[in-house]
């Protein structure tokens, strides 16, 4: 365990990291669910999209999200890894031209319509915390992750490495 300062030092390079290619290295269409198997769903309401975390009925179809994966280079002076350090970043798009965005001021996760190149708020560092789960860390705010709060997605500050396995920031990806 390396405590609060360790997590921030470990991820501080996110502020300066650059996406090494404008094209994703791979893309994956998947449904997104929580550690407790609740589905992440998207609904168009009053010309804007809302994001929900809910239990689906047995035969209800899950919403799909296009995950686009990008390589991002650590600046060598930050990572301590020379030119070697790389991170895997992801953008999440549930429908054409809309992407999940981190709103760090409101601690919220929102769907915004935008054109490429996407803003930094649409990029999340992918973490494997658990054998079959992933977590999404804000590129613009190291130590802050997409999480579940009151049946909605929210931004959750994780202040120590022990809390990185907390269930509310763990998500499952599935083709079904």
């Amino acid at each position: 365990a390396f405590g609060i300062s360790g997590v921030q030092k470990y991820t501080r390079a996110l502020h300066d990291s650059s996406i090494t290619g404008i094209s994703p290295i791979t893309e994956y269409l998947a449904s997104l669910s929580t550690y407790n198997d609740q589905s992440i769903t998207f609904a168009l309401e009053d010309e804007s999209y809302e994001i929900y975390v809910e239990d689906l009925k047995k035969d209800e179809k899950k919403d799909k999200v296009l995950l686009s994966y990008y390589e991002s280079q650590h600046p060598s002076n930050e990572s301590g890894d020379g030119v070697d350090g790389k991170m895997l970043m992801v953008t999440l798009s549930p429908t054409k031209d809309f992407w999940l965005h981190a709103n760090n001021k409101e601690h919220s996760v929102e769907l915004h319509k935008c054109e490429k190149p996407l803003p930094d708020q649409a990029f999340f560092v992918l973490h494997n915390m658990h054998s079959n789960c992933v977590s999404f860390e804000c590129k613009t705010d190291p130590g802050v992750f997409i999480g579940v709060k009151d049946n909605h997605l929210a931004l959750i500050k994780v202040d120590s490495s022990e809390n990185l396995c907390t269930e509310n920031i763990l998500f499952k990806l599935s083709e079904t």
Partner: antibody, heavy 122, light 107 residues
Framework: EVQLVESGGGLVQPGGSLRLSCAAS????????MYWVRQGPGKGLEGVSG????????YYTDSVKGRFTISRDNSKNTLFLQMNSLRAEDTAVYFC???????????????WGQGTLVTVSS | DIQMTQSPSSVSVSVGDRVTITCRAS???SSWLAWYQLKPGKAPKL??????SLQSGVPSRFSGSGSGTDFTLTISGLQPEDFAVYYC?????????FGGGTKVEIK
């Protein structure tokens, strides 16, 4: 330059214990997924155990669960594999490896040590 | 656990030939597959990651393709230094499992 150097291998009797070390240099160990892989005589590669950089979560293949323990010492930038209740089928060259990406194992393993030989025999 | 089935187990070829090795996963692994080269007494060398991304420093005669469950490693224009054993590895979820290996031998 990234370097991984394994040590601690040797001859041990069935039921015995060994502790393997992997000294890392040129990068911060805790920032990456680290992985132990073995190759038995005349056999293929087999993943043994991994540890997540971000959370420190640990993972084991079924055949070593309850017998092997992976850990790391961040201050010494060193990875360990404690092997107890060793069996003849654990005889292999053991490699440590570092992930391509920090925070995820999705990209596989880019840097490898030269390996250390563990022989379990009476 | 995800099983990885690699074929062929061995292939005899000449310098300059094109070699194709296939790997099949027992369940969908998206594009999370890596290919390694292993020579006796040496550490494994990463060739391809994320199914088709060429690792830095690896010659462009190596290429990878596929997604889902079926993947291919192609060596076009085999060089003398390419005779080795090649392994696929699913990097989707732990335990990260390897294929049985393909030995590329001189004809």
């Amino acid at each position: 330059e990234v370097q991984l150097v394994e040590s601690g291998g040797g001859l041990v009797q069935p039921g015995g214990s060994l502790r393997l070390s992997c000294a890392a240099s040129g990068f911060t160990l805790r920032s990456y997924v680290m992985y132990w892989v073995r190759q038995g005589p005349g056999k293929g590669l087999e993943g043994v155990s991994g540890i997540s950089g971000s959370s420190g979560g640990t993972y084991y293949t079924d055949s070593v669960k309850g017998r092997f323990t992976i850990s790391r010492d961040n201050s010494k930038n060193t990875l360990f594999l404690q092997m107890n209740s060793l069996r003849a089928e654990d005889t292999a060259v053991y490699f440590c490896a570092r992930s391509v990406y920090s925070t995820t194992w999705y990209g596989g393993f880019q840097h490898w040590g030269q390996g250390t030989l563990v022989t379990v025999s009476s | 656990d995800i099983q990885m089935t690699q074929s062929p187990s061995s292939v005899s070829v000449s310098v300059g030939d094109r070699v194709t090795i296939t790997c099949r996963a027992s369940q969908v692994i998206s594009s999370w597959l890596a290919w390694y080269q292993l020579k006796p007494g040496k550490a494994p060398k990463l060739l391809i990651y994320a199914a088709s991304s060429l690792q830095s420093g690896v010659p462009s005669r190596f290429s990878g393709s596929g997604s889902g469950t079926d993947f291919t490693l192609t060596i076009s224009g085999l060089q003398p230094e390419d005779f080795a054993v090649y392994y696929c590895q699913q990097t989707n979820s732990f335990p990260l499992t390897f294929g049985g290996g393909t030995k590329v031998e001189i004809k």
